[in-house]
């Protein structure tokens, strides 16, 4: 929801968390502001305190329940409001009717591990975290490998167009240190975006056997 120079963006992690960022040019840093969540068809509501993340933007996480509980469904609509204290009263700064499953950003994949490593290849697996059972297998992944002397931004993206929680990296250099990251995105949702990248997994390929043609 955009109002003049105000921007209010939220994402649902598909289970029990809505993360919001509100930015407003010229807003006072010391103003106390909150995000209020009012689902249209639930008995609960939730509030979180917006905390500054930069000169003109604030963020907070609406914790709706235990991490793996399914707190919202595909038909819920949540009214989200930014409320800021002005003296003794609260003023509404931004509002949006939020469709959780149109605005998804999952948690970063976790539990990355090397399943098997050789001189030229490495098999890596991971797990998705706090992802709704709604998605069945309809998720996609992007992965990238950091090679020596390069940056993450230079790393080519590998796309996995299905729910495949492993990858076999090929054509690696023997006895070389690499890092690997992966992120996930559901197919569902007009404004859905990629999860954050996972924590990098460091691994080293095996050295080539002496006297062998590699």
């Amino acid at each position: 929801a955009v109002n003049g120079t105000s921007r209010f963006t939220c994402f649902y992690n598909s289970r029990a968390n809505i993360s919001c960022v509100w930015s407003q040019d010229g807003a006072l840093q010391d103003t106390s502001c909150q995000v209020h969540a009012w689902p249209d068809r639930r008995r609960w509501n939730q509030t979180c305190e917006l905390l500054p993340v930069s000169q003109a933007s604030w963020a907070c996480n609406l914790i709706l329940g235990t991490p793996d509980s399914q707190k919202l469904t595909a038909v819920d609509i949540v009214t989200l409001r930014v409320m800021c204290r002005e003296g003794v009263r609260w003023r509404m700064m931004a509002i949006q009717d939020f469709k959780p499953f149109e605005n998804l950003r999952l948690m970063a994949p976790i539990s990355l591990q090397v399943v098997h490593v050789e001189t030229h290849r490495c098999n890596i697996s991971w797990k998705i975290s706090q992802a709704s059972h709604y998605f069945e297998r309809h998720l996609e992944f992007e992965a990238r490998t950091l090679s020596p002397g390069h940056t993450w931004e230079e790393a080519p993206l590998m796309t996995l167009k299905q729910k495949q929680e492993w990858i076999c990296l090929e054509t690696l250099t023997p006895d070389t240190q690499y890092e690997f990251q992966v992120r996930v995105k559901p197919l569902q949702g007009e404004f859905t975006t990629w999860s954050p990248w996972s924590q990098p997994l460091a691994f080293r390929t095996k050295p080539a056997a002496l006297g062998k043609d590699t």
């Epitope: 399914q70 469904t73 038909v75 709604y134 069945e136 197919l187 569902q188 007009e190």
Partner: antibody
């Protein structure tokens, strides 16, 4: 292999209630959604509702809300759809289907319900 | 509720030719549109999700596209087993609704 096997054809009188079962196998029933869809002759497909076995919640289409009840028995991996106050226009094939909320990935074979006096 | 209108109601095409089926939503539904195939005496089968994503196991000759509120299912080279009824379904606004179907018959 994913399978949904429905109970057999039913003949009912107007005003009666019908209860159809849908026995599933090949996937984790406790983490699934089971939908029910009506296909009346010459009327196309109508989505009736779902049960979310993990969240323990049901969702019904407004057109069926007053007369339909969807339940599940997780001990037998079976979903049920009960339709009450039957009328002649409820004569149809009823399907159960597995899916996320948004679309129906696997379907049962269908159960024909005939409402006739 | 959103009304899904499919056209034509019946489409006659020769085997080996291309078939184009249309589905129009009465309001904007983003890409929340799914296609099913139903053969006589059988349950529907999911073909395409979110307007253009093929389901695994579905032949590559089936493809989907979108232009605004109009969605198209294209079968590039019709096989005998493709003659059936095709339904679209929206999942943007509750309750989910289906089109009335397009019957694809042999010319």
């Amino acid at each position: 292999e994913v399978q949904l096997v429905q109970s057999g054809a039913e003949v009912k009188k107007p005003g009666a209630t019908v209860k159809i079962s849908c026995k599933v196998s090949g996937f984790n029933f406790k983490e699934s959604l089971i939908h029910w869809v009506q296909q009346a002759p010459g009327k196309g497909l109508e989505w009736m509702g779902w049960i979310d076995n993990e969240a323990g919640e049901t969702e019904y289409a407004p057109g069926f809300q007053d007369r339909v009840t969807i339940t599940a028995d997780t001990s037998t991996d079976t979903a049920y759809m009960e339709l009450s106050s039957l009328r002649s226009e409820d004569t149809a094939v009823y399907y159960c289907a597995r899916g996320g909320p948004w679309f129906l990935s696997y379907w049962g074979q269908g159960t024909t319900v005939t409402v006739s006096s | 509720e959103i009304v899904m209108t499919q056209s034509p109601a019946t489409l006659s095409v020769s085997p080996g030719e291309r078939a184009t089926l249309s589905c129009r939503a009465s309001q904007i539904i983003s890409n929340n549109l799914h296609w099913y195939q139903q053969k006589p005496g059988q349950a529907p089968r999911l073909l395409i999700i979110y307007g253009l994503q093929s389901i695994s196991g579905i032949p590559a000759r089936f493809s989907g596209s979108r232009s605004g509120t109009e969605f198209t299912l294209t079968i590039s080279s019709l096989q005998s087993e493709d003659f059936a009824v095709y339904f679209c379904q929206q999942s943007n606004n509750f309750p989910w609704t289906f089109g009335q179907g397009t019957k694809l018959e042999i010319k």
